[in-house]
């Protein structure tokens, strides 16, 4: 997978009025990474990983940055039209990838009341615009404002590209996220399910990279997709991931079935506790 | 107009603690941390430490761990320093200043600490 | 923790001439560098943030550049009430350093 940073910015507008502060949020390689103190003007590290990330640095460029980029967005919200009666929301969301070709991307995404309405490719500057009516309608007056706006020029978008990737190589030259992996811990539970069968779940916890493969395997051979129940492979908040698979069988038959896990080039077999 | 108004000049004996006050207006004091900067006379300045009156979150210098306890009172719209058993080198002037992402953009007129027997 | 170097200790300008302040970074900060001014007696005053952003209230002639590890203040025109010390301050990594002051007096 590649490296991803990916800010999201939310300002929210009452009976057509814009309101002060913002929301905003950093993740780095799909881990929450930074959230923004809007009582204290502070980008603050989510958990001890984040912090390990940039270790005594103060967080003052991040900081600004997303004070910045939410003044931004506000003012952007403020030239909305449409705005009706009751809570509105802009939602930005800006991301940049850098892959294992070296190549990168990056992409900006507005969203208002949580529709798509606008996207642009940083690098080619390419706007896209979905097909409804209000899609276009709001996409057409950000985009006026955005033209209007000295500082949304070609020279900003190409800026944006930069910053992100900029900021993405930084965190990555830390070391602490770059090229790490961190074993799984499997743990099988079972569990009373109807009468003469048993739930058997197998959960996979703090690993990285996310990607995992986890299944039930019965006499050594896995189980098919629709006898088995996956959870999403989710962020624990400590810069890890955690994930789990579950299937019901016959009480009795417990020895005959075992949970495999196969993570960077590891593999395990778990069997189902007695 | 913002305005730092702080406590006059202090004789103190050494090891007898001192507390220093810096009383804000102008502005919201609770949405601002507040710095803390040392300068020893001829000398250049030193940060000690900052501290958030929404709940008190503090930031020390880890050289000034052991010396200085940054407060706040919100009713009274102060920040305070104690600085325990003082020594000769703390012999000092001591600067609250407004924080701005991570710069000091207002200052006050400072509190000259003399520690003597 | 950064340590900031700042050259000359002393600068003598006649007025109305241009001068230059030097402060070295031990390691890369970015633009994460401030510039202040302490006159005699006085509290220090922000002059410059961030390396180059000018701050209100501050006359025109006072400017900043630079960065990574070495950075300028410049007042473009000395005038008799820039006699003062400057100091450069970082805010990249913590704790907060200081330079330890250039001192500006008239010829």
């Known amino acids: 997978e590649p490296h991803s940073l990916r800010y999201n910015l939310t300002v929210l507008s009452w009976d057509g009025s814009v309101q002060s502060g913002f929301l905003a949020e950093v993740h780095l390689d799909g881990q929450p990474f930074l959230r923004y103190d809007r009582q204290k003007c502070r980008a603050k590290p989510q958990g001890q990983w984040a912090e390990d990330v940039l270790g005594n640095k103060t967080w003052d460029r991040e900081t600004r940055d997303l004070t910045g980029n939410g003044k931004d967005l506000r003012m952007t919200l403020a030239h909305i039209k449409d705005q009706k009666e009751g809570l509105h929301s802009l939602q930005e969301i800006r991301v940049c990838e850098i892959h294992e070709d070296n190549s990168t991307r990056s992409s900006q995404h507005f969203y208002y009341d949580g529709e798509l309405f606008l996207s642009q490719n940083l690098e080619t500057e390419e706007w896209t615009v979905p097909q409804s009516s209000r899609a276009q309608t709001l996409a057409m007056n950000v985009r006026n404002f955005l033209k209007e706006d000295a500082m949304k020029t070609k020279t900003h978008y190409h800026a944006m590209h930069a910053d992100c990737l900029q900021e993405l190589r930084r965190y990555l030259e830390s070391g602490v996220v770059l090229r790490r992996t961190v074993p799984p811990m499997v743990n099988v539970t079972r569990s009373e399910a109807s009468e003469g069968n048993i739930t058997v779940t197998c959960r996979a916890s703090s690993f990285y990279p996310r990607n995992i493969i986890l299944t039930w395997r019965q006499d050594g051979v896995s189980l098919s997709h629709d006898t088995q129940q996956w959870g999403d492979v989710l962020p624990d908040g400590n810069g890890t991931y955690q994930t789990w698979v579950a299937t019901r069988i016959c009480r009795g038959e417990e020895q005959r079935f075992t949970c495999y896990m196969e993570h960077s080039g590891n593999h395990s077999t778990h069997p189902v506790p007695s | 107009q913002v305005q730092l108004q702080q406590s006059g000049a202090d004789l103190v004996r050494p090891g007898a603690s001192v507390r220093l006050s810096c009383r804000a207006s102008?502005?919201?004091?609770?949405?601002?941390?507040m710095n803390w900067v040392k300068q020893r006379p001829g000398q250049g300045l030193e940060w000690i430490g900052m501290?958030?009156?929404?709940?008190?979150?503090?930031r020390l210098n880890q050289k000034f761990k052991d010396k200085a306890t940054l407060t706040v009172d919100k009713s009274s719209n102060t920040a305070y320093m104690q600085l325990s058993s003082p020594t000769s080198e703390d012999s000092a002037i001591y600067y609250c200043?407004?924080?701005?992402?991570?710069?000091?953009?207002?200052w006050g007129q400072g509190t000259s600490v003399t520690v003597s027997s | 923790d950064i340590l900031l170097t700042q050259s000359p200790a002393i600068l003598s300008v006649s007025p109305g001439e241009r001068v230059s302040f030097s402060c070295r970074a031990s390691?890369?900060?970015?633009?994460?560098i401030h510039w202040y001014q302490q006159s005699t007696n006085g509290s220090p005053r922000l002059l410059i943030k961030?390396?180059?952003e000018s701050i209100s209230g501050i006359p025109s002639r006072f400017s900043g550049s630079g960065s990574g590890t070495d950075f300028t203040l410049t007042i473009n025109s000395v005038e008799s009430e820039d006699v003062a010390d400057y100091y450069c301050?970082?805010?990249?990594?913590?704790?907060?350093?200081f330079g330890a002051g250039t001192k500006l007096e008239l010829k």
């Open positions: 200043a407004r924080d701005d992402f991570f710069t000091m953009d207002y």
């Open positions: 102008g502005y919201s004091f609770t949405n601002y941390w």
């Open positions: 501290i958030h009156p929404s709940d008190s979150e503090t």
């Open positions: 390691q890369n900060i970015v633009t994460s």
């Open positions: 961030y390396a180059s």
């Open positions: 301050q970082q805010s990249n990594i913590w704790p907060l350093t």
